[in-house]
Amino acid sequence: IVLRPSRVHNSEENTMRALTLKDILNGTFSYKTFFPNWISGQEYLHQSADNNIVLYNIETGQSYTILSNRTMKSVNASNYGLSPDRQFVYLESDYSKLWRYSYTATYYIYDLSNGEFVRGNELPRPIQYLCWSPVGSKLAYVYQNNIYLKQRPGDPPFQITFNGRENKIFNGIPDWVYEEEMLATKYALWWSPNGKFLAYAEFNDTDIPVIAYSYYGDEQYPRTINIPYPKAGAKNPVVRIFIIDTTYPAYVGPQEVPVPAMIASSDYYFSWLTWVTDERVCLQWLKRVQNVSVLSICDFREDWQTWDCPKTQEHIEESRTGWAGGFFVSTPVFSYDAISYYKIFSDKDGYKHIHYIKDTVENAIQITSGKWEAINIFRVTQDSLFYSSNEFEEYPGRRNIYRISIGSYPPSKKCVTCHLRKERCQYYTASFSDYAKYYALVCYGPGIPISTLHDGRTDQEIKILEENKELENALKNIQLPKEEIKKLEVDEITLWYKMILPPQFDRSKKYPLLIQVYGGPCSQSVRSVFAVNWISYLASKEGMVIALVDGRGTAFQGDKLLYAVYRKLGVYEVEDQITAVRKFIEMGFIDEKRIAIWGWSYGGYVSSLALASGTGLFKCGIAVAPVSSWEYYASVYTERFMGLPTKDDNLEHYKNSTVMARAEYFRNVDYLLIHGTADDNVHFQNSAQIAKALVNAQVDFQAMWYSDQNHGLSGLSTNHLYTHMTHFLKQCFSLSD
């Protein structure tokens, strides 16, 4: 299946050129997407090319500048947020990144009615998180780990919490592990639908062991970065959820929401909070051994001013074959009756599907079914449910958007996207306005990405929001590689793969092969998306074949494949990459003396283990920021898949699955090990231990560290990294420079 059908081919071969590394590093062929910033059922905001914030009304066709670039520039604003009453805008500047999602910033409030910044009772700086209430213009913000409330932007703040302390107590924002591995947000506070209540999490990290690493900077002495970071088996954060009435915050103060008894009996996590109405909230909890999740629906008791979570409104989700959920436990989408909800979880055949829960999980009505998976519920209206799945034509690496009519019986299903731009677009996401009056579709490929606006009732396309015309024109004289997505059937396992082939690929010739691997639980690498990246360059210019393979442990193909790796990470993921390589060799166009593997993060772990598998298949390989032992990685992530590193649980496999245990096996491969010294996520410790084991085994290897760089190796380090890896691979494959 050739996946670049939208490319316009220039018949004059001599005007075509191959991709260069410089093209990739400069982002020459990057694409744009258009996600409307919805502010109503028919209006959205968008930042224009000249940085004006423009309001568009789809129904009336009106558009106008709500905030000028001049105002934005006056405070060097890089972001904005309109209050729901449209009286104020917050302007965000001095962005300072912390971890994956978190950052601090300075906030200014601009009054749209008089065209001036609000003076008096200005916000402190830097703020860790700030947001408007869903209606009106109340503000909640987090400063120095405490939560504050303003009834109006110019009012003095009301302090909600007082116990916040750096690295100890976090209010309204997550600590490191909750941010990275559980919430996947920078915030841990949630307004009720009409802004009456504010719910927030408090994380107590007092007893959590601290990871410390040097940040070299420019000073005479390096700084030490300290992060409370629970590694596998270590003491975890203690979480509590509180709710405060924002109309009369001083009246009774924050009220704690009770934890379900079956959860509170041992270590547990809070996983998400969903407001249903102003006086009903849904909390999800998870046992530390992450195969039991409890969804608890709580109601406000006016008489006691407390939150009541009756046992009859507790819904248990349990996995007997793996962990609960996919990567995360799914969140509920409530229907209009404010008690029943839709949720994705495994059906009896082990495929993740949408279920409708009215009273108990046992009596759930299955809404979708089949040997494919429902992936995301976008929106539920009174008569429709919009979701994405990989059902169409049985390609797990595709995403199409479907509408199920829930207002009629039996419910009818319609694929909204399957036939829109079939060759160009097979991987969609969507963004819905209030009540799904309109929606934007963002197609990521396999052709050049395109974003379109649609009517929520008829699904009619209204207009193209972004079609990447400049990119399309720029690619007209580029010899892009060919891509195909196919599958291998091996011992009752289906291994989907993506192969990236040189432009003048000839099956009768032999090519060097590079395997790019991630392979982490519930991940997916083989996707029908557009990309012009480093591996595109390696195929286009350097004549390599690149392959990506989704083996056991990967997502969206059923629980059998997903949960195969449960409690034994580092075994089947590696086996399946090796199996695929053997199959590729059988295809006849791979030079079996020139095969390499590379990966980043979990992929660095898999590539290291593959190189040390003793198969003799790989000549060389690269591991960027690899995990080397699961005892070094975060508790929430690691224990989800591995259990605890204790004798009576799974310590043996923790020990057996390290990279260090296989140090001897690196003797016959060329190994390049790369890591940032300021990696807060996969600590430099991981690579330090690999290096130590290799030195102790007297095994030669190559290494590169990036001083003061985190897990992303961004900025100039990116250029250096890819240049360095290119040289390494070209040397390995005996390709001339």
């Epitope: 109503s40 009106q62 106008y64 709500i66 209606v135 009409n194």
Partner: antibody
């Protein structure tokens, strides 16, 4: 406190053009938060939305009147105006200018109204 | 356009009575509904917005309820100053449309 005041002739002949102006005081018409609207009410009948305008001049007209309506804005005078062409007796009404306030998610209500001006179409 | 239908079109009541006016939308408008009171020769005055939120300064005897297509304005104990015409208005879809009005008269 925001105030709106309609002005214009109270009598217009059939087939001519009705012209009204709304003067805004106590606030700026250049406020980018809101639209400015015209609404009318025939004697003894209900209210009908005519159209709106933003400070930038961007307009929307009720489809039922679209072919005959023009709304314009003059930010220097803090005014916006209505022109309704080819009037008939059916256009006899009290004409109000109004401004909404927003609650959330685009949910708005008309919080500010002029006192209204009666325009009679008669020869 | 969304049609707004009020009932009754008029009603007679006494001071102290509980009065209920209903408004039906031709399609679902969620809670995008407002209620106004209009006295002769005056502009409409906002009472209730977003179906159930009481506008500041409006007496608490006025209340609103409903969602989707059916809405109610209730005056718990009618006062002499409440004799007027009441209009509902939707802001869910453009153009905004009003009900034809309900006239509350003295019995």
């Amino acid at each position: 406190q925001l105030q709106l005041q309609e002005s214009g002739p109270g009598l217009v002949k059939p087939s001519e053009t009705l012209s009204l102006t709304c003067t805004v005081s106590g606030g700026s018409i250049s406020s980018s938060s809101y639209f400015w609207a015209w609404i009318r009410q025939p004697p003894g009948k209900g209210l009908e939305f005519i159209g709106n305008i933003y400070y930038s001049g961007s307009t929307y007209y009720n489809p039922s009147l679209k072919s005959r309506v023009t709304i314009s804005v003059d930010t220097s005078k803090n005014q916006f105006s209505l022109k309704l062409s080819s009037v008939t007796a059916a256009d006899t009404a009290v004409y109000y200018c109004a401004r909404p306030s927003y609650y959330g998610s685009g949910n708005y209500y008309f919080a500010f109204w002029g006192q209204g001006t009666l325009v009679t179409v008669s020869s | 356009d969304i049609q707004m239908t009020q009932s009754p079109s008029s009603l007679s009541a006494s001071v102290g009575d509980r009065v209920t006016i209903t408004c039906r939308a031709s399609q679902s408008i969620s809670s995008y509904l407002n209620w106004y009171q209009q006295k002769p020769g005056k502009a409409p005055k906002l009472l209730i917005y977003a179906a159930s939120s009481l506008q500041s300064g409006v007496p608490s005897r006025f209340s609103g309820s409903g969602s989707g297509t059916d809405f109610t304005l209730t005056i718990s104990s009618l006062q002499p100053e409440d004799f007027a015409t009441y209009y509902c208005q939707q802001s869910y879809s453009t153009p905004p449309t009003f009900g034809q009005g309900t006239k509350v008269e003295i019995k």
